[in-house]
Structure formats: structure tokens, C-alpha cells
């Protein structure tokens, strides 16, 4: 008797079928960060809440120390939201100085770090220029597509000025990704 | 004869496997929304087509009465994007009273509803200072995340100014949901 | 002997199990694209990196000429980032004739063409007023939702001006489907 | 050492405006929460909001719409303002620095306290 | 907001005797957020405990905290004289809040 004789013949299996409720997924929050000072071409990682609230991960994909940890390689939807919120900003072509975090941009990046490679892959980017001229403001900046990664790999979200990022509400800023 | 000598080895169930095209799904669209009056602190849910155009509802995701209803427990995709629009805002520190559609700000949530449970929990928000002078503006909100959720959940979307909403376009303003 | 008895009692298979790594997907990123005079009325088409860098297509999802080629029936999750970039816009009441580069809005659209059906559909839409002033300005537009789609239909995103996309990095603008 | 020092009126009248600052000496603005606390006689301390060295504040949604807490990055201060005050709102006002550090968060440093009665 | 309920309010003991004050959070709090403060009269209070469990600069070994989601302990081993205060649990979420506060009196 051959296997497949007892299979549906419509199962055309090329590679292991699994239960979809056993990949890696995980969906992490915002939590208070340490609102350090904005350096101009450094873009500090979110530290995130992984098990409290709505936040969770499951099936190997572990959070540790600001990243995600990929279990296992395969196509996954990576997504972020960070609110970002802030004074009147600085959009006039003449700039004064010495005014503290009045940006003009505020950039959100999700990177792929591996460990066998030197540098970090930044994987999405999200940037735009402020100009709120007379009043504090706040807004979103959205991301999400799929990348093919590796076992190993490890994923972050980086911010411009990590001081304006909106901390306060776990449905306002948060990261995950799910093996598809 | 054990049943798995019949199946490939490398299937390796550990839950139940499932055919991908039977998980429930929805796509809803915009449809013209009953103006409502304008409460500060309470946030109108929108309704939605399920069956024309792109809409659909498939493999028991029902919709109903503004509420999508989750039929099985499991971990979903779950989107939504609002096109709002509005004449000039009020964005300098004072305001004037009484002036129809010129808001400070936009929001856009997603809630979940369980009967057992008194308080919606909100899912996700998009907010965004408006502060647009001299013309007419218009800008989507987007927003996406996985959430895992149980049979019976109900999810809508709530807006901060169901007026302000663009309801002219299908593909404008929408909201959907999968199970992974 | 029934083939049934062999399979895991809790398999409920109701349609043809697959394996997901199987299943067509890809993501495009972004490419300098060919300058071409602004239409009012008519949206050019991106065209797109395909096997470059973070961009693949797999399992029989082809690109071909600025078009995504569907290779199967089923709901597929689609979604691309446009970043756009500007001068100064115009957003008075008073426009100005002949001012390159100073939009009053920014468009994108996915949009599916089917060969059998004249008319192309529009899936998605993120349109966003500009009045930025006294600076160049620089934005993203996200878009993303599952539509069901047919064997042979085909995918492109649409821009309201394509000289104002920013094609520098493949981070900041691209194009992706996935069946799930 | 840093050290908070706190200053403002101590006697309001109903309907007046709370003002009081905090000088942080020994100490960097940056990569702190600057806060203010209160404490009514013979109860507990109740968060009234915080600022961070970009000017981003975050206030107890129950004094929101009456709290503004600023601040003055040259002289190292910031300030609390609570508008239309009644006597509910006699209490001593503490300024403290907000700790975070690798998602440990504390009130690390305290001000002296400043006794603030509102009476007719 | 998150509500923190200590008991008991108030706890009569002797110098030498072990002191075990409880907090409890209406909702989960991550460990690494919830502090102990202590309070003597017309003083500001002072960090004792933080991360739920590591006691700050300068505080004795005989404080000691514990706990995790919603139940969270402050133990002082031996009391002092100098213990007899009033002790306030603190959360740091997004919106901090205090408990009650537990009265530690010389019985």
C-alpha cells in the first residue's frame, strides 16, 4: 500500500503542512521609554511590553532586549504604528538655533539584524516632514509588508527622537509580526 | 496499520489542520453614514457594506448592525483605513466656538466587544492633529495589527466625527478582518 | 479501507490542503521610475524591483510591466507605502499657474485588471491633501486589505504624480500580495 | 548629588491659579521624567503629571483639563500650573524626577515639598 | 487607570518582628514598574524598592520586595525604630498611581 493512496487526492503536498495556530507570532505594545536626547543620525531602538494587555507571543518567537527573535525561517508580515507627539515644530527654511526637539521629521524603521552579517537591513521606512505651526501636534506613522527571514534573524523598531514617541496607550503605538 | 504511516512524514499536526480558503474572512466597505451630533468623548461607530463591490463576509464572519462577529477563537489580521475630510481646521491655541467641521483633530479606533465583559477594549488607534490653513483638506488613517481573539468577539470601528468621514469611494475607507 | 481512517481524526479537511510556504507571494520595492508629464485625470503606474535587494516573487506570483500577475484564485492580502517628497505646495485658494512640484494632493492606488472586464477596478485609494509651508516636505501613504482574486488578474499601483515619488531607498516605497 | 528645590505661592483663594517651579541643580534635563505629585492632609500621593525634556507632557486624566506642567530648559526648571483650584486642592505638591532605564521605571529624587491651602 | 489597594492600613508591631505589607493591582503591572516608597511625617517620601524586588542605593538588607501581576509584597525582616512610617506602593505605567498607603505603627 502506497501513503499517498490515503491522503485526499486534491492535497498536492510540496513541503510540511503545519496547524496554523502553532507558527510564531507575536503583537507588542508600547511601554514607557527612556526619553533620551535626539542625535541627529541615530535612531534609538523601542523597548516593548510583550505579555501584559494585548501584547503576546507564542510558538518560539520570543522578545528579548528591544528585539524579536526569529524561530524559525519563512515569510513573515512584520508590521509597526508609532505615534509620535510634539510641540510646535521648526518648518521654516530659516532655523533658529538652540530650540529644543521642535523636529522637522519624524522617522519610524524596522530592522533586520543578523548576526553573521555586519550591518543591520533596514527592512521598512516610514518618514515625514512636520510643520505644525501653532499648536502641539501628533500622528502615526503605519508600516507593514512581508519579508523572507532567516532562523536567527532579529527585528527592531527604530525612531528618530524616541522623546516624542506617544507611550501612553497600548493601541497607539505597537510591533509584531507573524509567520505566514 | 497506524493511520500515520500514511501521512507524509514531515507533516508534523500538532493542532488541527485546516483548509486556508474555509477561515473566516471579511472585507467591508464604506456606505454613507447617518450624520450624528458630535459628542466629545464618545466616538460613533461606523456601518459598513459586506456584500457589494469588494465587500464580502465568508466561512461564518457574519456582519451585523455596525459589528463584525468573530465565530471561532484564534489569531486575526485586522485592518481598517478612514478617509477623512474637512474644511479649514482650527489649529492656533485659541479656538472659535461654533465653527461645523473645522476639528483640531481626527481619530480612528478599533474596538472590540465581549458580551461577558463590560468595557470595550480598544485594539487600535490612529489620531492626528489637524492643523491645515487656508484650504479644504482630506487624509487617510490607516491601521493594522493581529490580535487574538475568542469566538463571539464583536469589532467595530469608531470614529472621532462621523461627518467628517469620506464615504464617496469603496476603496477610501474600509475595514477588514482573517484569521491566520 | 476508507483513506479517511489514515488521517488525523481532527483534520476537517472541506478544500485542498496546501502548504503555506507554497502559496504565491511577493514584494516589490521601488526603482527609479521614467519622469512623465502630469496628467490631471490620469495616474501613471510604478514599475518595480523584483528580485533585488528585500524584493521576490515566489511560487507563480510573476511581475511583468509594472503588473503583479495573480497565478491563482483566492484572497490575497495587498498593500504598498508610497513615499512622496515635494517642494513647497500650494494650498491657498488661489493657485498659481505653472509652479512645478507644488501639489495640492498626493494619490495612490492599487488598483486590478482584469483582461475580461473593460474597466480596471480600483482596490485601494490613499489620497492626502498637501499645504506645506515654507518648507520641502516629504510623506508616506500606506495601503493595505485582502481582496479575492482571480486566476489572470493583475495588480499595479497608481500614483497622482510620479515625479514626486521617492525611489532612493526600498524601504520607504513598495508593492506586495500574498495569498492567504 | 542632584537635588530639586520647589518654590510658589502657598495661600490661594477658590477660583485662583495654582503656580509653582522646580529647579533641578546636578542634574541634566535629559533622559528623565520631570514630575509633580501631590498630597493632601493626612492622605495619599496622587500623580498629577509629567513633562519630559522635550516639552512632551502626560497628565492624570482626572486634572487634565486644569494642569499645565512647562519648562525652562536654560535655568534647568519647570513648572506646574492648576487653574480654577478649590479647597480640594489643599495639599502638600511635590516636584520628583521620573527613573527609566531598560523598562524599570521609579521616582528616584524629590523636591521638599511645598504646602499649598485654599481657602476663602 | 490601574488601582492599588494595601493592606492592611494599618499594622501594629514591635521592633524585632517581621512586617509584611501587601499590594494589589486592579489589573496586571510589570514587575519592573512597581516601586515602595516610604514616608515619615512632614518628609518627602523615599525610594525603598524598585523593579518590585532590587532595593535602591542605601537601603538595608532587611527590606526586602516581591511579587508579580497583581500581588506584590514589601517585607522588612527585623524592624528598626526608624521602620515605624507610612509605606506607599507605586506603579509607573502610563498613568502612576499610589496605593493607600499602610501605617506601620510601634505597638
Known amino acids: 500500500l502506497k501513503g499517498q493512496e490515503f491522503a485526499p487526492s486534491h492535497q498536492q503536498v510540496y513541503a510540511p503542512l503545519r496547524a496554523d495556530g502553532d507558527k510564531p507570532r507575536a503583537h507588542l505594545t508600547v511601554v514607557r521609554q527612556t526619553p533620551t536626547q535626539h542625535l541627529k543620525n541615530q535612531f534609538p531602538a523601542l523597548h516593548w511590553e510583550h505579555e501584559l494587555g494585548l501584547a503576546f507571543t507564542k510558538n518560539r518567537m520570543n522578545y528579548t532586549n528591544k528585539f524579536l527573535l526569529i524561530p524559525e525561517s519563512g515569510d513573515y508580515f512584520v508590521y509597526s504604528q508609532v505615534t509620535f507627539r510634539g510641540m510646535t515644530s521648526e518648518c521654516s527654511e530659516i532655523r533658529q538655533a538652540g530650540r529644543p526637539n521642535k523636529p522637522d521629521s519624524i522617522t519610524v524603521v524596522i530592522t533586520k539584524v543578523t548576526d553573521s552579517y555586519p550591518e543591520p537591513t533596514q527592512l521598512l521606512m516610514g518618514t515625514k516632514s512636520v510643520c505644525e505651526v501653532g499648536s502641539n501636534w501628533f500622528q502615526p506613522i503605519y508600516l507593514g509588508a512581508m519579508f523572507s527571514l532567516q532562523e536567527g534573524d532579529k527585528l527592531m523598531v527604530n525612531v528618530s527622537d524616541i522623546s516624542l514617541v506617544d507611550y501612553t496607550k497600548e493601541d497607539k503605538t505597537f510591533f509584531g509580526a507573524f509567520l505566514l | 496499520l497506524k493511520g500515520q504511516e500514511f501521512a507524509p512524514s514531515h507533516q508534523q499536526v500538532y493542532a488541527p489542520l485546516r483548509a486556508d480558503g474555509d477561515k473566516p474572512r471579511a472585507h467591508l466597505t464604506v456606505v454613507r453614514q447617518t450624520p450624528t451630533q458630535h459628542l466629545k468623548n464618545q466616538f460613533p461607530a461606523l456601518h459598513w457594506e459586506h456584500e457589494l463591490g469588494l465587500a464580502f463576509t465568508k466561512n461564518r464572519m457574519n456582519y451585523t448592525n455596525k459589528f463584525l462577529l468573530i465565530p471561532e477563537s484564534g489569531d486575526y489580521f485586522v485592518y481598517s483605513q478612514v478617509t477623512f475630510r474637512g474644511m479649514t481646521s482650527e489649529c492656533s491655541e485659541i479656538r472659535q466656538a461654533g465653527r461645523p467641521n473645522k476639528p483640531d483633530s481626527i481619530t480612528v479606533v478599533i474596538t472590540k466587544v465581549t458580551d461577558s465583559y463590560p468595557e470595550p477594549t480598544q485594539l487600535l488607534m490612529g489620531t492626528k492633529s489637524v492643523c491645515e490653513v487656508g484650504s479644504n483638506w482630506f487624509q487617510p488613517i490607516y491601521l493594522g495589527a493581529m490580535f487574538s481573539l475568542q469566538e463571539g468577539d464583536k469589532l467595530m470601528v469608531n470614529v472621532s466625527d462621523i461627518s467628517l468621514v469620506d464615504y464617496t469611494k469603496e476603496d477610501k475607507t474600509f475595514f477588514g478582518a482573517f484569521l491566520l | 479501507l476508507k483513506g479517511q481512517e489514515f488521517a488525523p481524526s481532527h483534520q476537517q479537511v472541506y478544500a485542498p490542503l496546501r502548504a503555506d510556504g507554497d502559496k504565491p507571494r511577493a514584494h516589490l520595492t521601488v526603482v527609479r521610475q521614467t519622469p512623465t508629464q502630469h496628467l490631471k485625470n490620469q495616474f501613471p503606474a510604478l514599475h518595480w524591483e523584483h528580485e533585488l535587494g528585500l524584493a521576490f516573487t515566489k511560487n507563480r506570483m510573476n511581475y511583468t510591466n509594472k503588473f503583479l500577475l495573480i497565478p491563482e484564485s483566492g484572497d490575497y492580502f495587498v498593500y504598498s507605502q508610497v513615499t512622496f517628497r515635494g517642494m513647497t505646495s500650494e494650498c491657498s485658494e488661489i493657485r498659481q499657474a505653472g509652479r512645478p512640484n507644488k501639489p495640492d494632493s498626493i494619490t495612490v492606488v492599487i488598483t486590478k485588471v482584469t483582461d475580461s472586464y473593460p474597466e480596471p477596478t480600483q482596490l485601494l485609494m490613499g489620497t492626502k491633501s498637501v499645504c506645506e509651508v515654507g518648507s520641502n516636505w516629504f510623506q508616506p501613504i500606506y495601503l493595505g486589505a485582502m481582496f479575492s482574486l482571480q486566476e489572470g488578474d493583475k495588480l499595479m499601483v497608481n500614483v497622482s504624480d510620479i515625479s514626486l515619488v521617492d525611489y532612493t531607498k526600498e524601504d520607504k516605497t513598495f508593492f506586495g500580495a500574498f495569498l492567504l | 548629588q542632584v537635588q530639586l528645590q520647589q518654590w510658589g505661592a502657598g495661600l490661594l483663594k477658590p477660583s485662583e491659579t495654582l503656580s509653582l517651579t522646580c529647579a533641578v541643580h546636578g542634574g541634566s534635563f535629559s533622559g528623565y521624567y520631570w514630575n509633580w505629585i501631590r498630597q493632601p492632609p493626612g492622605k495619599g500621593l496622587e500623580w498629577i503629571g509629567e513633562?519630559?525634556?522635550?516639552?512632551?507632557?502626560n497628565y492624570n486624566p482626572s486634572l487634565k483639563s486644569r494642569v499645565t506642567i512647562s519648562l525652562d530648559t536654560s535655568k534647568n526648571q519647570f513648572s506646574l500650573k492648576l487653574t480654577s483650584v478649590t479647597a480640594a486642592d489643599t495639599a502638600v505638591y511635590y516636584c520628583?524626577?521620573?527613573?527609566?532605564?531598560?523598562?524599570?521605571?521609579?521616582?528616584?529624587?524629590w523636591g521638599q515639598g511645598t504646602l499649598v491651602t485654599v481657602s476663602s | 487607570e490601574i488601582v492599588l489597594t494595601q493592606s492592611p492600613g494599618t499594622l501594629s508591631l514591635s521592633p524585632g518582628e517581621r512586617a509584611t505589607l501587601s499590594c494589589r493591582a486592579s489589573q496586571s503591572v510589570r514587575s519592573s514598574y512597581l516601586a515602595w516608597y516610604q514616608q515619615k511625617p512632614g518628609q518627602a517620601p523615599r525610594l525603598l524598592i524598585y523593579?518590585?524586588?532590587s532595593r535602591a542605593t542605601g537601603i538595608p538588607d532587611r527590606f526586602s520586595g516581591s511579587g508579580s501581576g497583581t500581588d506584590f509584597t514589601l517585607t522588612i525582616s527585623r524592624l528598626e525604630p526608624e521602620d515605624f512610617a507610612v509605606y506607599y506602593c507605586q506603579q509607573y505605567g502610563s498613568s502612576p498611581t499610589f496605593g493607600q498607603g499602610t501605617r506601620l505603627e510601634i505597638k
Open positions: 523593579g518590585a524586588s
Open positions: 513633562i519630559n525634556h522635550a516639552g512632551i507632557t
Open positions: 520628583a524626577r521620573g527613573y527609566c532605564r531598560s523598562t524599570t521605571c521609579y521616582f528616584d529624587y
